[in-house]
């Protein structure tokens, strides 16, 4: 029997609701009362949902997932995982037995967007040209991990004297803070770029110090 | 007539190998999975191994895994069980089974394996 | 894993007689449980699938009930032919398919 799933892993938002998509291809005569379905974590075998005896036996995994009933009888054994956690990430195996039996793992990668960075100068008065200064670059609630870039007001790359910290919170989800020493020129604007690997997207924070004031894009 | 006819037993020593073979007739061999299930003397059933019609899903017995192969040649209608590293408690009758919906409805005489220094 | 229990492990009956024959899982398996007889120097044989369906050529002498995790495999007068060691197997929850333990019927 062969159990068909996708080849690259599914992304889904931190909150919102992902297709596991599964199918078989059920024989001439096949009846629902015949089908053994079964989606479980693939590394601890851990019971997600089942289908069997012809009746759906219901989501053994925070009550958040649902098959697609109506769709059963076509070879659909797709699931639905609702209000996706970061702790859902990984691997989900589809098991299908009828008269033959079949299986295939599918990947689940989780993701959530970087804030746009806030930006922090300390010290942040009476500056001078010479002067060493500490800019820190701040993004919340991201996953995976962020790629954390710097670059001068002409583009180019400042990777010496960069420190960045990641520290996940209660839910799985990155903060990012990202510290530049620099010393200042006569004038000059820093950004710094936080990007998300999985969801390629950069979120863009800049400082530009002008002699007096200082600017805050 | 579903037959399933084992062969490849004997008495072999510890950490040797034997590979068995099972062959099928009398039904569409590609369209069910194979199985096979021991018994030690006087003991109980324990199965062994399962392999899908394709022969593109296979599962072990905890007992088995990392020593055991299963595999199976749709154009020969034949099941095969490569077993290395053989231990004492591996001694047993192996029966090949045919797998539907779940059960096994159809059983070769099986083959006598004997692990012995 | 599902683990099956049979009981008793003996039985000892007089031909013509009933016999009942029980397996527990340690979980429930609904109705996929399958029951075999085995007999000296034989394969075992498929008698019922589904808990109470019998295989193809099973005389109705033999029945399953339950569902669940209790089952009872009854002989309503056992036959000479029929003194047997009896398994039963779950395919609810696989891998790994599971077998209880088996139940000998003697000759009382």
């Known amino acids: 029997l062969e159990v068909q799933v996708p080849e690259d892993p599914v992304v889904a938002l931190v909150g919102t609701d992902a297709t596991l998509c599964c199918s078989f291809s059920p024989e001439p005569g096949f009846s629902l009362a015949q089908l053994n379905l079964i989606w479980q974590l693939t590394d601890t075998k851990q019971l997600v949902h089942s289908f069997a005896e012809g009746q759906d036996q219901g989501s053994a995994y925070a009550n958040r997932t649902a098959l697609f009933p109506d769709l059963l009888a076509q070879g659909n054994a797709s699931l639905r995982l609702q209000r996706v956690r970061v702790a859902d990430e990984g691997s989900f195996t589809c098991f299908v037995s009828i008269r033959d039996f079949g299986s295939a793992a599918v990947s689940l990668q989780v993701a959530a967007p970087y804030s746009k960075p806030s930006m922090t100068l300390e010290p942040n008065k009476d500056l001078r040209p010479g002067d060493t200064v500490t800019i820190t670059c701040s993004s919340y609630r991201g996953y995976p991990e962020a790629e954390v870039f710097w670059q001068d007001g002409q583009g180019v790359p400042l990777t010496g004297n960069v420190t960045t910290s990641q520290m996940a919170n209660e839910q799985g989800l990155f903060d990012v803070h990202s510290v530049l020493r620099v010393v200042l020129g006569a004038n000059g604007t820093y950004s710094c770029l936080v990007r998300n690997p999985v969801l390629q997207q950069d979120a863009h924070g800049s400082v530009t110090i002008t002699g007096q004031p200082m600017t805050f894009p | 007539d579903v037959q399933l006819v084992e062969s490849g037993g004997g008495v072999v020593r510890p950490g040797e190998s034997l590979r068995l073979s099972c062959a099928a007739s009398g039904f569409t061999f590609s369209s069910y999975a194979e199985s096979w299930v021991r018994q030690a003397p006087g003991e109980g059933l324990e199965w062994v191994s399962i392999i899908s019609g394709s022969g593109g899903n296979t599962f072990y017995a905890d007992s088995v895994k990392g020593r055991f192969t299963i595999s199976r040649d749709n154009s020969k209608n034949t099941l095969y069980l490569q077993m290395n590293s053989l231990r004492a408690e591996d001694t047993a009758v192996y029966y090949c089974?045919?797998?539907?919906?779940?059960?096994?409805?159809?059983w070769g005489l099986g083959t006598l394996v004997t692990v012995s220094s | 894993e599902i683990v099956l229990t049979q009981s008793p492990g003996t039985l000892s009956v007089s031909p013509g007689e009933r016999a009942t024959l029980s397996c527990r899982a340690s979980q429930t398996v609904g109705s996929k449980l399958a029951w075999y007889q085995q007999k000296p120097g034989q394969p075992p044989s498929l008698l019922i699938y589904?808990?109470?369906t019998r295989a193809t050529g099973i005389p109705d002498r033999f029945s399953g009930s339950g569902s669940g995790t209790d089952f009872t495999l009854t002989i309503s007068s056992l036959q000479s032919e029929d003194f047997a060691v009896y398994y039963c197997q779950q395919y609810r929850n696989w891998p790994p398919l599971t077998f209880g333990g088996g139940t000998k019927v003697e000759i009382k």
């Open positions: 089974a045919r797998f539907a919906y779940g059960f096994f409805d159809y």
């Open positions: 589904d808990a109470s």
